[in-house]
């Protein structure tokens, strides 16, 4: 672990569990990028005062990275060559291949609200296709 603790959304929340989950996750939505390029996956938790203890990034239930309030970032060994932490609680994917196409999830572990999940669909396009503007619209 690099022990650089990130700037966490959510303050030092307290209180008991079973609360109403008022928060919402805003994401970059559906995005596309060129093969060989890079892309930033971003989520933002808003409308809650819950304390964020950890954010997990997953691709089809496979863990990519963890950002922990105490420990900072951990990148899964199988992705460490192509995944970079940040900016913020986001994740940067590098050297994209068509196999990176799919759904990505940011999972916010919070107290007392519990887990919030945001989803982003990434399509990795061949360079020639990307140049001709066949892109998803960001909502």
């Amino acid at each position: 672990y690099p022990y650089d603790v990130p700037d966490y959304a959510g303050g030092g929340g307290s209180g008991g569990g079973g609360s109403m989950m008022t928060g919402t996750i805003e994401t970059t939505g559906n995005i596309s990028a060129e093969k060989g390029g890079s892309i930033i996956l971003q989520c933002h938790l808003s409308s809650t005062t819950a304390q964020v203890t950890q954010v997990n990034w997953e691709q089809q239930d496979q863990l990519l990275a963890i950002c922990n309030a105490d420990l900072g970032w951990h990148i899964s060994p199988s992705f460490k060559d192509r995944v970079a932490p940040g900016p913020g609680l986001g994740l940067t994917l590098q050297s994209l291949t068509v196999n990176d196409t799919g759904e990505y999830a940011c999972i916010y572990h919070t107290y007392p609200d519990g887990t919030y999940t945001g989803r982003i669909f990434l399509e990795v396009l061949e360079s020639s296709v990307a140049e001709h503007g066949a892109r998803f619209q960001i909502p």
Epitope: G16, G18, T53, I66, A69, D70, G114, T115
Partner: antibody, heavy 119, light 107 residues
């Protein structure tokens, strides 16, 4: 090999205090959140408290809030549970358990230490 | 708090049987459910987490499924060492809560 060994249990009178310890070995203790879970005789499991790896997040079950205090000493690879104002209903086997790095459940448990609250 | 209800509370089965245990949450917990096995006088052992992910070292005859409020633990072919009590536990929000347990006994 991951090992968690609890100690400090025993017989105590209602209103008394006890301090449980959990000695961890076989992993980098300072990287993992830790829990205390208890089990009353012949009953099911009840989560008691959690402390994050660096102690920035501490949570308690409502049944023990204000009476129990969870703490840790990463330099000593140790987890603690200070139990005050003990009641008969606190009688149970107390387990310490490690939280998975991804925060998805408790992957290793100690063998437990028995706490009996009785006059 | 989220209530976890397990059924049945006990069952009798024979070696080689397929066994299914269900767990229902009082509100949606997404995929965040774990299953534990406990033998008398021993600590619980993690079998499944996040609904369906097998913990390292756990035999593949154990499997988990479900999401939202309804979950299932299946033992495809019961072995002698599988006779124990099984607990479900939600790890979606604090306080983490457990089901009442299902005791699997020898028929």
């Amino acid at each position: 090999e991951v090992q968690l060994v609890e100690s400090g249990g025993g017989l105590v009178q209602p209103g008394g205090s006890l301090r449980l310890s959990c000695a961890a070995s076989g992993f980098t203790f300072s990287n993992f959140g830790m829990h205390w879970v208890r089990q009353a005789p012949g009953k099911g499991l009840e989560w008691v408290a959690f402390i994050s790896s660096g102690s920035s997040s501490i949570y308690y079950a409502d049944t023990v809030k204000g009476r129990f205090t969870i703490s840790r000493d990463n330099a000593k690879n140790s987890l603690y549970l200070q139990m005050n104002s003990l009641r008969a209903e606190d009688t149970a086997v107390y387990y310490c358990a490690r939280m998975r790095l991804d925060y998805y459940a408790m992957d290793y448990w100690g063998q437990g230490t028995m706490v009996t609250v009785s006059s | 708090d989220i209530q976890m209800t397990q059924s049945p509370s006990s069952l009798s089965a024979s070696v080689g049987d397929r066994v299914t245990i269900t767990c229902r949450a009082s509100k949606s917990i997404s995929k965040y459910l774990a299953w534990y096995q406990q033998k008398p006088g021993k600590a619980p052992k993690l079998l499944i987490y996040s609904g369906s992910t097998l913990q390292s070292g756990v035999p593949s005859r154990f499997s988990g499924s479900g999401s939202g409020t309804d979950f299932t633990l299946t033992i495809s072919s019961l072995q002698p060492e599988d006779f124990a009590t099984y607990y479900c536990q939600q790890h979606n929000e604090y306080p983490w809560t457990f089901g009442g347990g299902t005791k699997v006994e020898i028929k």
